[in-house]
Amino acid sequence: AITEAREEAKPYPLFPGPFPGSLQTDHTPLLSLPHASGYQPALMFSPTQPGRPHTGNVAIPQVTSVESKPLPPLAFKHTVGHIILSEHKGVKFNCSISVPNIYQDTTISWWKDGKELLGAHHAITQFYPDDEVTAIIASFSITSVQRSDNGSYICKMKINNEEIVSDPIYIEVQGLPHFTKQPESMNVTRNTAFNLTCQAVGPPEPVNIFWVQNSSRVNEQPEKSPSVLTVPGLTEMAVFSCEAHNDKGLTVSKGVQINIKAIPSPPTEVSIRNSTAHSILISWVPGFDGYSPFRNCSIQVKEADPLSNGSVMIFNTSALPHLYQIKQLQALANYSIGVSCMNEIGWSAVSPWILASTTEGAPSVAPLNVTVFLNESSDNVDIRWMKPPTKQQDGELVGYRISHVWQSAGISKELLEEVGQNGSRARISVQVHNATCTVRIAAVTRGGVGPFSDPVKIFIPAHGWVDYAPSSTPAPGNADPVLII
């Protein structure tokens, strides 16, 4: 059976036989052996006493003595099988073997969980020669054990290509519970159940879990690790942690805040980045997201004109990049603009409204009812029109631009006239006789030149013709302008 010693064992050798391992790290040594770390072994070693060979891996030497007596089988002597100690304590344990002096170059290696321990470990081998045999003691020490030192340690020795293996020494490092899973912060829907998980391990086991919510214990009695807490729903933010208990004491997990998802706060700092005649580029700073990612935003636009019908235009956009170009606006108009954003819970309130104006634009329509007729007596062409509707002027009219094109026998020339905003008539001199004059008019604001009217053509005859009827833009629906003579 595996012999076991706890660190609380009394400071006396508990095991018969010559080379017991260290049972307890805090014992007063009876015989000190040199050691790399300066650590003193815990129990007395008496290399001259005969020991019990163990039943494990044994090498039977082929060599015999002068009297031809076969040598006894070689085996490591029994030592402590199981050492239990607390984290950060020191430990020393050993393997011992008596080897006939006929063998040279015997080396002992230490292995842990099947892997050889090389390098910076505190291992030391000492030799105690006698007449016929040499007692070899291999010591292994750890000055401050950690959980990673847990495992099964063995010694190996090679003789004549035979491998001799000691019984394992199990090191069990005990300490406070160690969390392998802790509760995580979450954002949850109000009054909706959710789960938190807590898992901790020893040794020693078992590890028991207590859940704590806002500093009150949820479970009055311990629950075995791992534990899943189903929180039946929250109406306000809460802080959760879990306590893990074992025989060594208590470890408390990090406290995690569980937030309740809510509608977002309204956006702030809505500002105008750029204005044109028909669009406004706005930006905003999102409000607090209510512990739930923004999904999209809504831009609300109202005409600020007190005489407007108060209708609200709504433009939906993605939550990012907190920028939106509002289009299809009237020129030279005042608007109130507000922004609202939504998450999975709902819409925020609207941001504080801001006032914004579009700039002057070029008129969006041409002058109406353009009429052209020839005044032969003065050798002029008279042009008349009606202003575009005020709403479609997109600014303050500063005048009109008249384009007249004269075409005769393969020759064509275009002339442009600028006229002031007063009145709705103009007179241009006949440039060429026996030619067609095509007239188009555009309204002009500081924002630019609007579209030209549909062309109106009039034929200018050679001198001596008698009567001329005016030419006009067609009535709506007619495909082409008509020339009336």
């Epitope: 009054n191 479970n219 009695q221 039946p232």
Partner: antibody, heavy 118, light 106 residues
Framework: QVQLVQSGSELKKPGASVKVSCKAS????????VHWVRQAPGQGLEWMGW????????TYAQGFTGRFVFSLDTSVSTAYLQISSLKAEDTAVYYC???????????WGQGTLVTVSS | EIVLTQSPATLSLSPGERATLSCRAS?????MHWYQQKPGQAPRPLIY???NLASGIPARFSGSGSGTSYTLTISSLEPEDFAVYYC?????????FGGGTKVEIK
């Protein structure tokens, strides 16, 4: 199914003692605490305290210390309430209840009427 | 100790009517449990942790509230619902019960 079965009614004289039992079945006894609740005739529910079935440690509410003792016998999944030096005002129905998370008393015994009268 | 005050002490209603029972705490609590008790019987769990129905409890019962104010609502009273209702807080020791609200037939 989970059941808490309490001992029968008791008629006691002032100064005597009484021990009420509460036998649990249908679940692992040591996983849940046992709460004790008193209800005087025509009155409301009054929490007396609870017994930790894992550690054996009792917790008493104010006004229930001294003469009141909670004990356990985990081998028979039974909780006990002992009242000594009985007074007339101890006359009440005493309930045991299983304590779940959030101190929710999810299963109740049928109650034990203790009458103290000379 | 957290004191729970239930109101009204008595509620006289007819079957089919809606019952609204209030439980106020002297300081903020995390959860409120509700129990129903009929004469000569042990209390029966009704609502767990403010708003969760105990097993076997019909959906006409509902619970709500937070902080110091909690409510038990019976949407349409059935004859078997006439009983005494108790609230019990979870937040701090000692665990305390309210004084009860008796729902009686009008």
């Amino acid at each position: 199914q989970v059941q808490l079965v309490q001992s029968g009614s008791e008629l006691k004289k002032p100064g005597a003692s009484v021990k009420v039992s509460c036998k649990a079945s249908g679940y692992t006894f040591t996983n849940y605490g046992v709460h004790w609740v008193r209800q005087a005739p025509g009155q409301g529910l009054e929490w007396m305290g609870w017994g930790n079935t894992y550690t054996g440690e009792p917790t008493y509410a104010q006004g229930f210390t001294g003469r009141f003792v909670f004990s356990l016998d985990t081998s028979v999944s039974t909780a006990y309430l002992q009242i000594s030096s009985l007074k007339a005002e101890d006359t009440a129905v005493y309930y045991c209840a299983r304590g779940n998370r959030y101190a929710y008393m999810d299963y109740w015994g049928q109650g034990t009427l203790v009458t103290v009268s000379s | 100790e957290i004191v729970l005050t239930q109101s009204p002490a008595t509620l006289s209603l007819s079957p089919g009517e809606r019952a609204t029972l209030s439980c106020r705490a002297s300081s903020s609590v995390s959860y409120m449990h509700w129990y129903q008790q009929k004469p000569g019987q042990a209390p029966r769990p009704l609502i767990y942790a403010t708003s969760n129905l105990a097993s076997g409890i019909p959906a006409r019962f509902s619970g709500s509230g937070s902080g110091t104010s909690y409510t038990l609502t019976i949407s349409s009273l059935e004859p078997e619902d006439f009983a005494v209702y108790y609230c019990q807080q979870w937040s701090s020791n000692p665990r305390t019960f309210g004084g009860g609200t008796k729902v009686e037939i009008k």
